[in-house]
Interface confidence: medium
């Protein structure tokens, strides 16, 4: 996504020759290169840049379409409800909004990867901030869902159900506020930076090495480790309680939320492991050499693509794992008069049509 201006060494002419003559990808870089300027050439980025140019635009375009359709469907289903949304459904609606906003920025990054950033510094800051706001929001909202379920099932405390309806909204507002705070560096340090020799402009960070490392640590901790720990803790306790109570219906009801969390972990763990390697190289704990740097750059592109795939995955999970979601989607299509559904007046199998399609509360255990 956003190009990071990592603190490159000064490139010497042996390397420029490789870059200009287009054989940099076959240039032999050992694993034990020193940091000195000229005894070993610093790292060319041609391979990772060419990889990004080929791989990212196609991936981002696909994710943009899938994410927009899927999350649009989720939002439509939730907003078509005649009754008030449950706490989990409210969080899921916010999650759909976060994912939609994130995928809306993908076409911009696709253009940036394919050609250059043509949208100016203002949109660079906004798109970068929007991207990170929604990256953090997705993770934190999943943590909120798991905490809500934890209170509900383990402590039999329906924090949002019995309290004022504003409580869940306030929680969501707090999440968005926190994400805005996390995105401040984007507003400050992101800009459309012109590479004079390549005659290309890219949306990238311009800040010192220490700031870059700090931001990555924040992303790793706040956007991944903390939410994942909260989810793991909450669901471990929930499953323990449900197994002890032999609540098979409850376990079935937990299925979707657990699958969503597992999907989050599977999608984002590879990316954050790569970021961790990068942090360790920044801190000098891992030796930085061209071979490793190039592999990290490519791995970052691939794993971040897998991470962004998570935005499109939630709607699919709801569709395939959530029975109620399928039913409500079907009803919505009927109500909209979908041409190929018009003649069929099929009724959903559940009689509790207004119960939550994701909630694992006393009101609806079979909803998934």
């Amino acid at each position: 996504m956003v190009l990071e201006v990592s603190d490159h060494q000064v490139l010497n002419d042996a390397e420029v020759a490789a870059l200009l003559e287009n054989f940099s990808s076959s240039y032999d870089y050992g694993e034990n290169e020193s940091d000195s300027c000229c005894t070993s050439p610093p790292c060319p980025q041609d391979f990772s840049l060419n990889f990004d140019r080929a791989f990212l635009p196609a991936l981002y375009s696909l994710l943009f379409l899938l994410g927009l359709l899927g999350n649009g469907a989720v939002a439509a289903v939730l907003l078509s409800r005649r009754t008030a949304l449950s706490s989990t459904d409210t969080f899921l609606l916010h999650l759909a909004v976060a994912d939609t906003l994130l995928v809306l920025t993908l076409p911009l990054w696709a253009v940036d990867a394919a050609v250059q950033w043509v949208f100016g510094s203002g949109l660079c800051k906004v798109a970068g901030a929007l991207f990170n706001i929604n990256f953090y929001a997705g993770a934190l909202l999943l943590a909120c869902i798991s905490f809500d379920r934890y209170l509900n099932i383990v402590h039999a405390t329906q924090l949002y159900r019995r309290g004022p309806p504003a409580r869940v909204t306030l929680t969501c507002l707090a999440v968005w506020g926190l994400c805005l705070l996390f995105a401040l560096p984007d507003f400050i340090f992101l800009s459309a930076h012109h590479d004079e020799r390549l005659n290309a402009t890219h949306c990238q960070y311009n800040f010192p090495q220490v700031g870059r490392t700090a931001l990555r640590v924040l992303q790793l901790v706040a956007g991944f480790l903390l939410p994942l720990l909260v989810m793991a803790y909450c669901y471990a306790h929930i499953l323990a309680v449900l197994l002890v109570s032999r609540g098979q219906r409850r376990l079935r009801a937990m299925r979707l939320v657990v699958v969503v969390v597992v999907a989050f972990a599977l999608c984002w763990t590879p990316y954050h492991l790569v970021v961790l390697v990068d942090i360790l190289m920044d801190l000098g704990a891992l030796a930085r050499n061209c071979g490793r740097e190039s592999r990290v750059d490519v791995a970052k592109s691939v794993t971040s693509g897998l991470g962004y795939m998570h935005c499109c995955l939630n709607p699919l999970l709801y569709a395939f794992v959530g029975v109620k979601f399928r039913e409500r989607m079907w009803m919505l299509l009927l109500r909209l008069g979908c041409p190929n559904q018009r003649g069929l007046q099929r009724q959903p199998s559940s009689s509790r049509r207004d119960s939550s399609w994701s909630e694992t509360s006393e009101a609806s255990y079979s909803g998934l």
Epitope: V10, D13, Q209
Partner: antibody, heavy 123, light 106 residues
């Protein structure tokens, strides 16, 4: 418009110290590697020190290694050269220069230069 | 260290003349860079990557060469071209400059 303004030069005794500054404006200072290049009176140019844009990597020729230290304050858009154990042969006009970017890396040549600050080492 | 030797060190020429300055490297270099310096002024980047003219440099200037020998050529000397020209290499550390060629009006 790219501008580099050196300051801090002057007369100093052999063995003494001096700190040169270079205030940068007109470009994103944090994105560029920077260098100091000197020119003894009536003589040619000599590269003195280079620092990568984030300050992680620094390079020196053997003639100044261990005596000179290049550093930068990106918050202040300022480049520094701390010169210790000065010798008569360090007498020169000291120029601050910017490295251009190519393919995301920093080149060894210089696309913009300041007007220089004169350092005289004499007893 | 790679030594760069410029020849001639001094060159007297007239407006309209074709002038060639040579820069020889003690061992092969990948590219050569040229700077122009006028008295009391800072050097200016003139040619980079051996033959690419820097922004604002007139097309009468050209650069060529490879390996150990490089040249800067002015096809038709103009009054504003009288200055000192330095070559520089960045193939191996330390970055070194030639001693300079002073171009004077005949």
């Amino acid at each position: 418009e790219v501008q580099l303004l050196e300051s801090g030069g002057g007369l100093v005794q052999p063995g003494g110290s001096l700190r040169l500054s270079c205030a940068a404006s007109g470009f994103t200072f944090t994105s560029y590697a920077m260098s100091w290049v000197r020119q003894a009176p009536g003589k040619g140019l000599e590269w003195v020190a280079t620092i990568s844009h984030g300050g992680t990597y620094t390079y020196y020729p053997d003639s100044v290694k261990g005596r000179f230290t290049i550093s930068r304050d990106n918050a202040k858009n300022t480049l520094y050269l701390q010169m210790n154990s000065l010798r008569a042969e360090d007498t020169a006009m000291y120029y601050c220069a910017r490295h251009p970017i190519y393919s995301g890396n920093y080149q060894g040549y210089f696309d913009y230069w300041g007007q220089g600050t004169l350092v005289t080492v004499s007893s | 260290d790679i030594q760069l030797t410029q020849s001639p060190s001094f060159l007297s020429a007239s407006v309209g003349d074709r002038v060639t300055i040579t820069c020889r490297a003690s061992s092969g270099v990948n590219y050569l860079y040229w700077y122009q310096q006028k008295p009391g002024k800072a050097p200016k980047l003139w040619i980079y990557f051996t033959s690419t003219l820097a922004s604002g440099v007139p097309s009468r200037f050209s650069g060529s060469g490879s390996g150990n020998e490089y040249t800067l050529t002015i096809s038709s000397l103009q009054p504003e071209d009288f200055a000192t020209y330095y070559c520089q290499q960045f193939t191996s550390s330390p970055y070194t400059f030639g001693q300079g060629t002073k171009l004077e009006i005949k």
